[in-house]
Amino acid sequence: KFSKQSWGLENEALIVRCPRQGKSSYIVDWYYSQTNKSIPTQERNRVFASGQLLKFLPAEVADSGIYTCIVRSPTFNRTGYANVTIYKKQPDCNVPDYLMYSTVSGSEKNSKIYCPTIDLYNWTAPLEWFKNCQALQGSRYKAHKSFLVIDNVMTDDAGDYTCKFIHNENGANYSVTATRSFTVKDEQGFSLFPVIRAPAHNETKEVEIGENTNLTCSACFGKGAQFLATVQWQLNGNKITDFSEPRIQQEEGQNQSFSNGLACVNTVLRIADVKEEDLLLRYDCLALNLHGLRRHTIRLSRKHHHHHH
């Protein structure tokens, strides 16, 4: 409950806000959930708390975990959880689903792409923008405050857009990148019965106990903008939100990508610190549109280590 997923890349800055709303004057205490150890407020620490914000300057893969924030107002104490995952930098250009923020869609008239989470950082313009890892150049692209505007949007403008900026903390600079998909609304579209691309039905995924794992549910629904197209994960036939286990979270927002002109939607189930009991659960990837519902099931199994003599 009151848990928010946050993610970032190693050696970049990551700033996370406590998911409980309140006034900036409220005292907020931050703890490592597993150890209940208080997080320092002194800025000389690489990880420190600053009111409603938890700052990783810079982040390391080992910072991944669940953090507890307690917001203390004069009348109430409210608890929230920040589920943080820090990933290794990708060697190639490909940005995996689990690093993507929610998809935005645009049309000829409206083509603003906001840089996700930027409001949490102390940054100065201009932002750098990349599409599919290539720096954007040309008069069609205008970096304006915290968003990118594309003039005369065309279907080939669809793709993954990354914003890059510098966070400044006490004179020290830290790089931050964030990526989201941009889709272009196509008037000539159609919809199909959902086709689940991943996982395969009755698939089994090998996992290590104690490690983190991600399951991607990906389905295609037709061509062009879809009126209703949603994918979600269920655990033993129950909604994730009804399953009160903060280690298991479905990402906020769904990423839309176009594969061979098809409208496809992905959502990632993030499982932190895999436990034995997670292997007993049935994980259902559900894809739903106006044509109906399709379900693929995946289970987790313990990774077998092969010993070579």
């Epitope: 409950k1 009151f2 709303q21 309140g22 006034k23 004057s25 409220y26 917001v71 107002s73 004069p74 009348t75 109430f76 409210r78 909604k239 939100t241 009804d242």
Partner: antibody, heavy 117, light 106 residues
């Protein structure tokens, strides 16, 4: 002990405006949120809106949007609720209550507003 | 808008009885449900916040439970001073009170 003392009962004509005050003691009004709640005779509680007195940010329930204005004077630790274009169904007891973003902890004694021609 | 359905609207019970009042929301809310007691001519009083946290000074016979869309206030053994009207309040999205449950002496 935290106390919220509201202004006295009011009788208003339809179409008029009423402004109720709520003075907070043993508590700094800037430190929390101030909520206002309506209760018509024999009826349930209806949340009207809230203010963060430190910065003046307000949020109103859809039902009262456009007719209610909540303000706060941090120098006197007093909050105000103004309701305009009064009609007979606005006859009610109005409560101020302090709390955080999510709920109310301490309540005023209530102010009865009667709207009658 | 989040709708709250509180039931029953009225309830007759005797001293010593165990009583439960239910609130159902039309959408999943993050345990941001609170329970208030109101006596005639008085301001409401907060009993339980965040689903199940007892407010300091509130007797332990009051308890809250539930999650998602279904929430319950339980009074384990009714005392004479408990006869009043009870309201649930959701604050997941703005704030909405339930319709109230009037608890009367049988």
């Amino acid at each position: 002990e935290v106390q919220l003392v509201q202004s006295g009962a009011e009788v208003k004509k339809p179409g008029a405006t009423v402004k109720i005050s709520c003075k907070v003691s043993a508590f700094n009004i800037k430190d929390d949120y101030m909520h206002w709640v309506q209760q018509a005779p024999g009826k349930g509680l209806e949340w009207m809106g809230r203010i963060d007195p430190a910065i003046g940010n307000t949020e109103y329930a859809e039902k009262f949007q456009g007719r209610v204005t909540i303000t706060a004077d941090t120098s006197t630790d007093t909050a105000y609720m103004e309701l305009s274009s009064l009609r007979s169904e606005d006859t009610a007891v109005y409560y101020c209550a302090t709390g955080d973003f999510y709920a109310m902890a301490y309540w005023g004694q209530g102010t009865l507003v009667t709207v009658s021609s | 808008d989040i709708q709250m359905t509180q039931s029953p609207s009225s309830l007759s019970a005797s001293v010593g009885d165990r009583v439960t009042i239910t609130c159902i929301t039309n959408t999943d809310i993050d345990d941001v449900i609170h329970w208030y007691q109101q006596k005639p001519g008085k301001a409401p009083k907060l009993l339980i916040y965040e689903g199940n946290t007892l407010r300091p000074g509130v007797p332990s016979r009051f308890s809250g439970s539930g999650s998602g869309t279904d929430f319950t206030l339980t009074i384990s053994s009714l005392q004479p001073e408990d006869f009043a009207t009870y309201y649930c309040l959701q604050s997941d999205n703005m704030l909405t009170f339930g319709q109230g449950t009037k608890l009367e002496i049988k």
